[in-house]
């Protein structure tokens, strides 16, 4: 049976050209954790397998890092990481927990001001 | 501490079986794949046989299948492997080295943790 | 059956220096491929899985790169204690999985 629940930072937003860090946490479980997927839509960003520890998807070396803890720091972004992100926390006996969180990336205050002001 | 620890090995004449065993601890048998890489004294190495975390799924190199079976006891954290119709080509150190993966992430098929081998002679 | 080849056989490096060990596959296997070293007496030792990953507490000075059929393992600047046998292998979802023939790396 599976007793867990896994607590994420749910729906968060950014600075385009900033960083932010994705956090889940399994809880109410005393499951063991095995390997931690990151997903975005259908694409593997990360893994963080308890014997290997972490791969980074060669796609997104350069802006994504391992961590904190079984989270993951996402660098130099852009809209087009809007979107849905999956923590999959693959545990023995439970199973396979998910946990969403709904990242906005948005212009920057100052590129706004920008582009609204902009002399012609 | 992860730890594999074969035993089961020796001198065996061609055509003679032996049963290798590997005494798991520090780590959660059940859910991980578990593999058997042997080597050749002064050879490279060469990956014997495979076998998923409930036991239930099993796969063999072309040169063992039909004399070796690979099989494991999750209740006494043991791996084995029951070697028939032994040939002087199966002399080698064999050695039990733990999958990364579990049913529910997947198999590696690669081996960070290994034990420190068993040497099984095929000789008259 | 996809037959991973290593070349040098033996590779003769001084300390300090950097060696580049190669490994072919018959037919891709993607990036399923890993690295190990072994020292006579002991058991493989994981260096390099995904082709370019390191695994779990291994020093900065080995890479690997490469996908398809061609890779490359590199040790930056050599150990003493980086004197040893290296074999690639690959994993491609199906058995078998195979390994090089290993090469070794002995002191110049």
């Known amino acids: 049976m599976m007793t867990g629940t896994i607590e994420t930072t749910g729906n968060i937003s950014a600075e385009k050209g900033g960083s932010i860090i994705l956090q889940c946490h399994l809880s109410s479980t005393t499951a063991q954790v095995t390997q931690v997927n990151w997903e975005q839509q259908d694409q593997l960003l990360a893994i963080c397998n308890a014997d290997l520890g972490w791969h980074i998807s060669p796609s997104f070396k350069d802006r994504v890092a391992p961590g904190p803890g079984l989270g993951l720091t996402l660098q130099s972004l852009t809209v087009n990481d809007t979107g849905e992100y999956f923590c999959i926390y693959h545990t023995y006996p439970d199973g396979t927990y998910t946990g969403r969180i709904f990242l906005e990336v948005l212009e920057s205050s100052v590129a706004e001001h920008g582009a609204r002001f902009q002399i012609p | 501490e992860v730890q594999l620890l074969e035993s089961g090995g020796g001198l065996v004449q061609p055509g003679g079986s032996l049963r290798l065993s590997c005494a798991a601890s520090?780590?959660?048998?059940?859910?991980?794949?578990m593999s058997w890489v042997r080597q050749a004294p002064g050879k490279g190495l060469e990956w014997v046989s495979a076998?998923?975390?409930?036991?239930?799924?099993?796969w063999y190199a072309d040169s063992v299948k039909g004399r070796f079976t690979i099989s494991r006891d999750n209740s006494k954290n043991t791996l084995y492997l029951q070697m028939n119709s032994l040939r002087a080509e199966d002399t080698a150190v064999y050695y039990c080295?733990?999958?990364?993966?579990?049913?529910?992430?997947?198999?590696?098929?690669?081996?960070?943790?290994w034990g420190q081998g068993t040497l099984v002679t095929v000789s008259s | 059956e996809i037959v991973m080849t290593q070349s040098p056989a033996t590779l003769s490096v001084s300390p300090g220096e950097r060696a580049t060990l190669s490994c072919r596959a018959s037919?891709?296997?993607?990036?399923?491929l890993a690295w190990y070293q072994q020292k006579p007496g002991q058991a493989p030792r994981l260096l390099i899985y995904?082709?370019?990953t390191r695994a779990t507490g291994i020093p900065a000075r080995f890479s690997g790169s490469g996908s398809g059929t061609e890779f490359t393992l590199t040790i930056s600047s050599l150990q003493s204690e980086d004197f040893a046998v290296y074999y690639c292998?690959?994993?491609?979802?199906?058995?078998?999985?195979?390994f090089g023939g290993g090469t070794k790396v002995e002191i110049k």
């Open positions: 080295a733990k999958d990364p993966g579990t049913h529910y992430s997947g198999y590696y098929y690669i081996w960070r943790y």
């Open positions: 520090g780590f959660t048998f059940g859910p991980y794949g």
């Open positions: 076998i998923s975390g409930s036991g239930a799924s099993t």
């Open positions: 037919q891709s296997v993607s990036s399923n």
């Open positions: 995904s082709a370019s």
């Open positions: 292998q690959q994993y491609v979802p199906h058995p078998p999985f195979t």
